[in-house]
């Protein structure tokens, strides 16, 4: 079997939902010593970057300016060390937002409910679209989809305090082209009196995967690695 290097990690810096005409940044984290990184879009080569010096950095950032629907879709990356290529990374879906119109989000029976009540969100957009998306802030990967001509409903069932938070919806023109976001609707769920103080609230920090953790190798790291290698040999 043909030998390959471990697959790299692909991430979107800050968010995978990019407003049209803004810049997207995709990070491909591979390995120190990689001489070339390739970004692929919908199966075709999109861009190439050759880090300098290759042994000092474990990945690259690909900048995609002027986001539009032609650049929205599935991205992956690979890297090369010498003549040996890595496996392909997982796929990353890059979405363009702020296309066309703004939907309206409402919640029934209302934004303030008691734990155990059934809640339904309604997303309405009068322009031609059939797919609607509901996202909870801080949980942008947990996208709920629903379908309807001008309005879609998102039944949440009996809610708990875990459902607390701010929600937005989008109309979708295809999987990768979304409308402007709706105004946020904040859902407040009150629990039993004795549980209310213990109920967790959503973290306000952004999604943890929306960060590029590329590192430069320092002289100190190199010395430590060499020392560790020497120590291992001495132990043997």
């Amino acid at each position: 079997p043909k030998q390959t290097l471990p697959k790299p990690i692909i991430r979107a810096e800050s968010t995978y939902m990019v407003p049209k005409e803004k810049q997207a940044t995709l990070c491909c984290q591979g390995s120190y010593g990689a001489v070339e990184y390739q970004l692929h879009f919908e199966g075709s080569l999109f861009a190439v970057e050759r880090p300098k010096p290759p042994e000092r950095i474990n990945g690259v950032k690909f900048h995609i300016p002027d986001m539009n629907s032609r650049k929205a879709g599935r991205y992956s990356c690979i890297y090369r060390v010498g003549e040996l290529w890595s496996e392909r990374s997982d796929l990353l879906d890059l979405v363009v937002t702020e296309m066309y119109d703004t939907p309206t989000l409402s919640v029934h029976p209302g934004p303030e409910v008691t734990s155990g009540e059934k809640v339904t969100f309604y997303c309405r957009l009068d322009t031609a679209t059939s797919m609607f998306l509901l996202l909870k802030e801080g949980r942008s990967r947990d996208v709920q989809r629903s379908y309807g001509k001008v309005q879609a409903e998102f039944p949440m069932g009996p809610v708990t305090t875990a459902h607390r938070g701010s929600y937005r919806c989008f109309g979708s023109y295809n999987n990768y082209a979304w409308s402007f976001p709706s105004e946020p609707v904040k859902l407040l769920v009150t629990g039993d009196i004795e549980n209310t103080s213990l109920a967790p609230t959503d973290p306000t920090f952004p999604d943890s995967w929306d960060t590029c953790l590329l590192t430069r190798e320092t002289g100190l790291q190199k010395d430590l690695a060499l020392w560790d290698h020497t120590a291992q040999n001495l132990l043997r």
Partner: nanobody
């Protein structure tokens, strides 16, 4: 707004050479990644060659070893030196730019490019 104007096209015999130029207006040229694409009659537009801000280059397999892309930031111009030309190189050649870029990527996919020239015709025939 960036404007790109290609020149240098013409008719040449197989085995001959041509140098295409692409002059860019605007002060953003040094921060632009540049590329050349071509479109033969009745065919899709295809990638030819590209150059990053830091002069890294990438070529289509069909032109590797025959074509050379280069840039002169002082003149706001990118060049495509074409040698050992073949009949299948006949096409309209387009210059394109990705503006702005912040890294040193070489862009290969046509969707990456946000500015395009009008094209210059290259005809290779005996």
């Amino acid at each position: 707004e960036v404007q790109l104007v290609e020149s240098g096209g013409g008719e040449v015999q197989p085995g001959g050479s041509l140098r295409l130029s692409c002059a860019a207006s605007g002060r953003t040229f040094a921060s632009a990644a540049m590329g050349w694409f071509r479109q033969a009659p009745g065919k899709e537009r295809e990638f030819v060659a590209a150059i990053s801000r830091s002069d890294d280059t990438y070529y289509a397999e069909s032109v590797k070893g025959r074509f050379t892309i280069s840039r002169d930031n002082a003149k706001n111009t990118v060049y495509l030196q074409m040698s050992s030309l073949r009949a299948e190189d006949t096409a309209v050649y387009y210059c394109a730019a990705v503006v702005p870029t912040y890294g040193n990527a070489i862009y290969v996919h046509s969707a990456a490019y946000n500015y395009w020239g009008q094209g210059t015709l290259v005809t290779v025939k005996p």
